[in-house]
């Protein structure tokens, strides 16, 4: 990864970035004054417009999500946008601010009872009522009552990484999402070539930890594209 650094004399606490653009490699998107952002009613002038290009939610802050800035816009154009508050429209959990989740297209409070019910409801809606198992695990085994903590421990059900304790991230496991350890040096990681490709994984891995990046293992450079092994390596 590109190592970026915090400057000790840096200007801090300026207005949060309202966006940025992500697209296909080499693509460019204009950052013009007076762009209207979804979820807000104001026009933001270029004076404090700080576009933050993103490929996925994890690159944005806990109070943000990664999405196209315009309704019906180019699907490849993505920026960090402010999360949606309660009763605002949503399409997925990450769009809702911490303490909320997306239910029937609306951000609602994720108090424990509703949260648990919604996870089961989502599983049922997405995969039908078939309660069959995979590798001996029930689709609902990760939903035990012990899994609701203020900051999720390893194995706890989560909606986003901010729900998990330090050193853990929120990643898909079967048909749920649980807190898993952030990857350490030498561990196998997943390099996503396309936005959204991680959505196909039943067992999603966390990202590499601080100071590490997901790169092709040196002795695998000659291997075919499909068999290249990526591991977390020092910059």
């Amino acid at each position: 990864t590109l190592n970026s650094v915090l400057n000790s004399n840096a200007i801090k606490n300026l207005p949060p970035p309202l966006g940025g653009a992500a697209g296909h490699p080499g693509s460019a998107v204009s950052a013009a004054p007076g762009i209207l952002y979804p979820g807000g009613n104001k026009y933001q002038t270029i004076d404090n417009y700080q576009p933050y290009p993103c490929a996925e939610d994890e690159e944005c802050g806990t109070d943000e999500y990664c999405a196209s800035p315009t309704r019906g816009g180019d699907a490849g154009v993505q920026i960090c946008l402010a999360c949606r508050k309660r009763r605002k429209r949503c399409m997925r959990h990450a769009m809702c601010c911490p303490g909320n989740y997306c239910k029937n297209g609306i951000c609602v409070s994720s108090d424990q009872n509703h949260f648990r019910g919604e996870i089961e409801e989502t599983i049922t809606e997405s995969f039908g009522n078939d309660h069959s198992t995979l590798d001996g695990y029930s689709r609902r085994t990760t939903l035990s009552s012990k899994m609701y903590h203020t900051k999720g421990q390893e194995g706890s059900v989560c909606l986003r990484s901010s729900d998990c304790a330090s050193g853990l991230c929120c990643a898909r496991h079967f048909w749920s999402k649980i807190c898993k350890p952030v990857l350490k040096e030498g561990q196998v990681c997943t390099k996503h070539r396309r936005k959204g490709s991680h959505g196909l994984e039943i067992f999603q891995r966390c990202y590499c930890g601080e100071g590490l990046s997901c790169r092709i293992q040196k002795d695998h450079h000659q291997a075919s594209n499909s068999s290249r092994l990526h591991t977390c390596q020092r910059h």
Epitope: T1, L2, N3, S4, V5, L6, N7, A10, I11, K12, L14, P16, P17, G20, A21, A22, G23, H24, P25, G26, S27, A28, V29, Q50, Y52, P53, C54, A55, D57, E58, E59, C60, G61, T62, D63, E64, Q78, C80, R160, S161, S162, S166, C169, K195, Y207, C208, E210, G211, L212, S213, H235
Partner: nanobody, 124 residues
Framework: EVQLVESGGGLVQPGGSLRLSCAAS????????MGWFRQAPGKEREFVAA????????VYADSVKGRFTISADNSKNTAYLQMNSLKPEDTAVYYC?????????????????WGQGTLVTVSS
């Protein structure tokens, strides 16, 4: 101490070119986003360009689109801003900006942190 150090600024004639570099040094953390901002005398700091290296994703201010190109060299921990067809109104202090890594590092918002800047003067 941690730093973003810009270089490459200077005096150039209208229509000329310059290439700015931003080297990251000191205690580092992983960020996929780098950017450039500028501040002309008596004006607000404004966004110029940003890049998300993971997909070669770029965004530009309208005022520089088609003239400036942002890029990054992962292996050298360096970001670049190639500036062509420079105009007198491009005269400013140019600041390199580093993304804070977002939620992976516990931040509520993805923000930029700035270097000290390098002066670019476009004048005949």
């Amino acid at each position: 101490e941690v730093q973003l150090v810009e270089s490459g600024g200077g005096l150039v004639q209208p229509g000329g070119s310059l290439r700015l570099s931003c080297a990251a040094s000191g205690r580092t953390f992983s960020s996929k986003t780098m950017g450039w901002f500028r501040q002309a005398p008596g004006k607000e700091r404004e966004f110029v360009a940003a890049i998300n290296w993971s997909g070669g994703l770029t965004v530009y201010a309208d005022s520089v689109k088609g003239r400036f190109t942002i890029s990054a060299d992962n292996s050298k921990n360096t970001a670049y801003l190639q500036m062509n067809s420079l105009k007198p109104e491009d005269t400013a202090v140019y600041y390199c900006a580093a993304g804070n890594g977002g939620r992976a590092y516990g931040y509520s918002r993805a923000r930029y942190e700035w270097g000290q800047g390098t002066l670019v003067t476009v004048s005949s």
